[in-house]
Interface confidence: medium
């Protein structure tokens, strides 16, 4: 679990891009907006995140969608799918 910390000045992520690989886990948690992540999931595959960073991104999506991810997010999970458990997948309402 990544503890809640304020995002340092100037570090708020305006978009999901390559600069985020140099963010520490707590910075990703504090500085990446979950709704922004959900709308830009297609970019994640183009960014060489570490497994630890993927964990944080998944945690953010889990908080945003506690009842399960919408289809728009599921379709663009890409490598983040590696982090999904059977319990996560059971929540999805895929048509």
């Amino acid at each position: 679990e990544v503890e809640k910390t304020a995002c340092p000045s100037g570090k708020k992520a305006p978009e999901i891009d390559e600069s985020l690989i140099f963010y520490k886990k707590w910075e990703l948690e504090a500085c990446v907006d979950a709704a922004l992540l959900a709308t830009q999931m297609d970019r994640v595959n183009a960014i060489p995140f570490t497994y630890e960073q993927l964990d944080v991104l998944k945690h953010k999506l889990d908080e945003l969608y506690p009842q399960g991810y919408p289809e728009s997010v599921i379709q663009h999970l890409g490598y983040l799918f590696l982090k999904m458990s059977p319990e996560d997948i059971r929540k999805w309402n895929v048509t």
Epitope: E18, I21, T50, E52, L54, Y79
Partner: antibody, heavy 121, light 107 residues
Framework: QVQLQQPGAELIKPGASVKLSCKAS????????MHWVKQRPGQGLEWIGI????????NYNERFKSKATLTVDKSSSTAYMQLSSLTSEDSAVYYC??????????????WGTGTTVTVSS | DIVMTQSHRFMSTSVGDRVSITCKAS??????VAWYQQKPGQSPKLLIY???TQHTGVPDRFTGSGSGTDFTLTINNVQSEDLLDYFC?????????FGAGTKLELK
């Protein structure tokens, strides 16, 4: 089998630039991220940066941001690294290295043969 | 940056011995550690990844262990062809970083 072929050596004058090549064979070049690593005698290894051959996405170690530029030529399955404003500190062996086949596994399962860059007037 | 410290630049051993090469990370890296072997004038070769998983074709005498900040590469029944340089690397966070290396020498 999987191979990354690099020229053996380059002799460069101080202040000049050099473009190092890394020709891949034996696998689908566009499917794997490619890294570049520097090794100076007795000083271990330093990660320079990474490029995805298919999408051209690059990331650099902050220490090399103004020194190295990574590019690829998909048609020839070749990765390139340009080093600029060379000094004696840049004299080293430079390796290209393919990351493992699994996303998130940022270790290197295949290394290039290495190019020895010597900066000397 | 995460610093990977290999405290012994050189280690002495004898053929048939068991030797342990250590690597310490400056912060927790989980099990995101790889070990490489390097012959003089050649490129490094992957031995171990995820701290303890042997790469394909690596002899069973090479084993890796550890998690968090302390990692060990153990060579059982050292052979003369093992007297080489060994490097650790963390891939928990960027920039990816390596240890300075440990050179195995004959006693």
């Amino acid at each position: 089998q999987v191979q990354l072929q690099q020229p053996g050596a380059e002799l460069i004058k101080p202040g000049a630039s050099v473009k190092l090549s890394c020709k891949a064979s034996g696998y689908t070049f566009t499917s794997y991220w490619m890294h570049w690593v520097k090794q100076r005698p007795g000083q271990g290894l330093e990660w320079i940066g990474i490029i995805h051959p298919n999408i051209g996405s690059t990331n650099y170690n902050e220490r090399f941001k103004s020194k190295a530029t990574l590019t690829v030529d998909k048609s020839s399955s070749t990765a390139y690294m340009q080093l600029s404003s060379l000094t004696s500190e840049d004299s080293a062996v430079y390796y290209c290295a393919r990351r493992s086949s699994n996303y998130g596994d940022w270790y290197f399962d295949v290394w290039g043969t290495g190019t020895t860059v010597t900066v000397s007037s | 940056d995460i610093v990977m410290t290999q405290s012994h630049r050189f280690m002495s051993t004898s053929v048939g011995d068991r030797v342990s090469i250590t690597c310490k990370a400056s912060q927790d890296v989980g099990t995101s550690v790889a070990w490489y072997q390097q012959k003089p004038g050649q490129s490094p070769k992957l031995l171990i990844y995820w701290a303890s998983t042997q790469h394909t074709g690596v002899p069973d005498r090479f084993t890796g262990s550890g998690s968090g900040t302390d990692f060990t590469l153990t060579i059982n029944n050292v052979q003369s062809e093992d007297l080489l340089d060994y490097f650790c690397q963390q891939y928990s966070s960027y920039p990816l970083t390596f240890g300075a290396g440990t050179k195995l020498e004959l006693k």
